[in-house]
């Protein structure tokens, strides 16, 4: 059986998790990708996802999560800003490929967030940069954060306009250093 590996990220409250999930360029460039949390005994929960098909270098934001899919480099960049202690947990990047199982991109990420001043600029400072937000959704899709008829699994949303709303405006540039400790199960 394939050995699942974890990469441990130890961060302070207020810092930013910045991970890059590599994928096979030829196979998955335009596939829809998602960021999931896996809690003990729970089904994976999709917290955020790219569009369908995934757009190159177009950031999408859901709450404090920002996803950017770089087709040319074959990587999905995931950022979680202004980290909270309750964000601690096991995460994974996946690629949706119905009707096949979602394809997990190794390694899983074990995030440990502790209290305390980070000593680096916080990610929750005011910013004049664009904040990319998911447009309002009225119908549900396989990945929940985009408008799409529920009986159709291919339809992408019409657009994802850059919209700034009062809740969770964030700075997209400040990314703190991280401690990466491979952990093998």
């Amino acid at each position: 059986a394939t050995k699942l590996t974890e990469e441990k990220y130890e961060l302070k409250e207020g810092q930013t998790l910045d991970v890059k999930c590599d994928y096979t360029l030829e196979k998955f460039a335009s596939s829809q990708k998602a960021w999931q949390i896996i809690r003990d005994g729970e089904m994976p929960k999709t917290l955020a996802c790219t569009e369908r098909p995934s757009k190159n270098s177009h950031p999408v934001q859901v709450g404090r999560i920002i996803l950017e899919d770089y087709h040319d480099h074959g990587l999905l960049r995931v950022r979680m800003v202004n980290l909270q202690v309750e964000d601690s947990g096991l995460y994974q990047c996946v690629i949706y490929q119905p009707p096949k199982e979602p394809h997990m991109l190794f390694d899983r990420i074990r995030l440990v967030v502790t209290k305390g001043f980070s000593g680096t600029p916080g990610s929750n400072e005011n910013s004049t940069q664009n904040v990319y937000k998911i447009p309002p959704t009225t119908t549900k899709a396989l990945c929940p954060l985009y408008t799409s008829p529920r009986t159709v699994t291919q339809a992408p949303p019409k657009s994802t306009a850059d919209v700034s709303t009062p809740d969770s405006e964030i700075n997209l540039t400040n990314v703190t250093d991280i401690i990466r400790v491979p952990v093998f199960n």
């Epitope: 999931q36 949390i37 809690r39 005994g41 729970e42 089904m43 994976p44 929960k45 999709t46 917290l47 955020a48 859901v62 709450g63 404090r64 999560i65 979680m80 909270q84 309750e86 964000d87 949706y96 119905p98 009707p99 199982e101 979602p102 549900k140 396989l142 990945c143 929940p144 529920r150 009986t151 699994t153 809740d167 969770s168």
Partner: antibody
Framework: QVQLQESGPGLVKPSETLSLTCAVS?????????WAWIRQPPGKGLEWIGS???????YYNPSLKSRVTISVDTSKNQFSLKLSSVTAADTAVYYC?????????????WGQGTLVTVSS | DIVMTQSPDSLAVSLGERATINCKSS????????????LAWYQQKPGQPPKLLIY???TRESGVPDRFSGSGSGTDFTLTISSLQAEDVAVYYC?????????FGGGTKVEIK
């Protein structure tokens, strides 16, 4: 649109096994999502029994786990519930639904439900 | 398990008046990272299955009249029917899908006064 339809015997004897099937139309089970069973005793509230993914991965309500088996048949686009050692307390309307718990957090849509009575 | 407590058990409201149903969870159903509350509201009429009204605590399901609205975050939630219509007579349930086992509130019966 997605539609679900429960089927199975409406009467089961105490200590026997209740068996129900949910046929899904308008959507391929293999395309994703979990699929759930829920029950509602007459005049009472709703209770989640368990959910299954097309790969066979299951989650069960701990209160029923020892007696429940949920299985899936992707070739027939259906999933099934077996509840063993039933008693009168298992008399209920049994519903199947698409489980969006890993996504939006809701059950939608639901089947019309089928009443199962446990009696000798 | 997360316990969902609904109040009141029943509610009689005049046509055109506001109906308010409360739901309290024994622990938070908010995932702060994506700012989503995994809380749904359903309407159930006699002899029918529950019908999804609201998900993510405040997102109205497609086709649901805008007199239905959901609010709240964390552990305290409210379903509001801004102007009660005769066809709104039903039992309403909240449900949490933050942590398994998924659990429902006991239901609130809404009637016409």
């Amino acid at each position: 649109q997605v539609q679900l339809q429960e089927s199975g015997p409406g009467l089961v004897k105490p200590s026997e096994t209740l068996s129900l099937t949910c046929a899904v139309s308008g959507y391929s089970i293999s395309s994703g999502y979990y699929w759930a069973w829920i029950r509602q005793p007459p005049g009472k509230g709703l209770e989640w029994i368990g959910s299954i993914y097309h790969s066979g991965s299951t989650y069960y309500n701990p209160s029923l786990k020892s007696r429940v088996t949920i299985s899936v048949d992707t070739s027939k686009n259906q999933f099934s519930l077996k509840l063993s050692s039933v008693t009168a307390a298992d008399t209920a309307v049994y519903y199947c639904a698409r489980d969006l718990g890993g996504y939006e957090g809701a059950f939608d849509p639901w089947g019309q439900g089928t009443l199962v009575t446990v009696s000798s | 398990d997360i316990v969902m407590t609904q109040s009141p058990d029943s509610l009689a409201v005049s046509l055109g008046e506001r109906a308010t149903i409360n739901c309290k969870s024994s622990q938070s159903v908010l995932f702060s990272s994506n700012n989503k509350n995994y809380l749904a509201w359903y309407q159930q009429k006699p002899g029918q299955p529950p019908k999804l009204l609201i998900y993510w605590a405040s997102t109205r399901e497609s086709g649901v009249p805008d007199r239905f609205s959901g609010s709240g975050s964390g552990t305290d939630f409210t379903l509001t029917i801004s102007s009660l219509q005769a066809e709104d007579v039903a039992v309403y349930y909240c449900q949490q899908l933050a942590f398994t086992p998924w659990t429902f509130g006991g239901g609130t019966k809404v009637e016409i006064k």
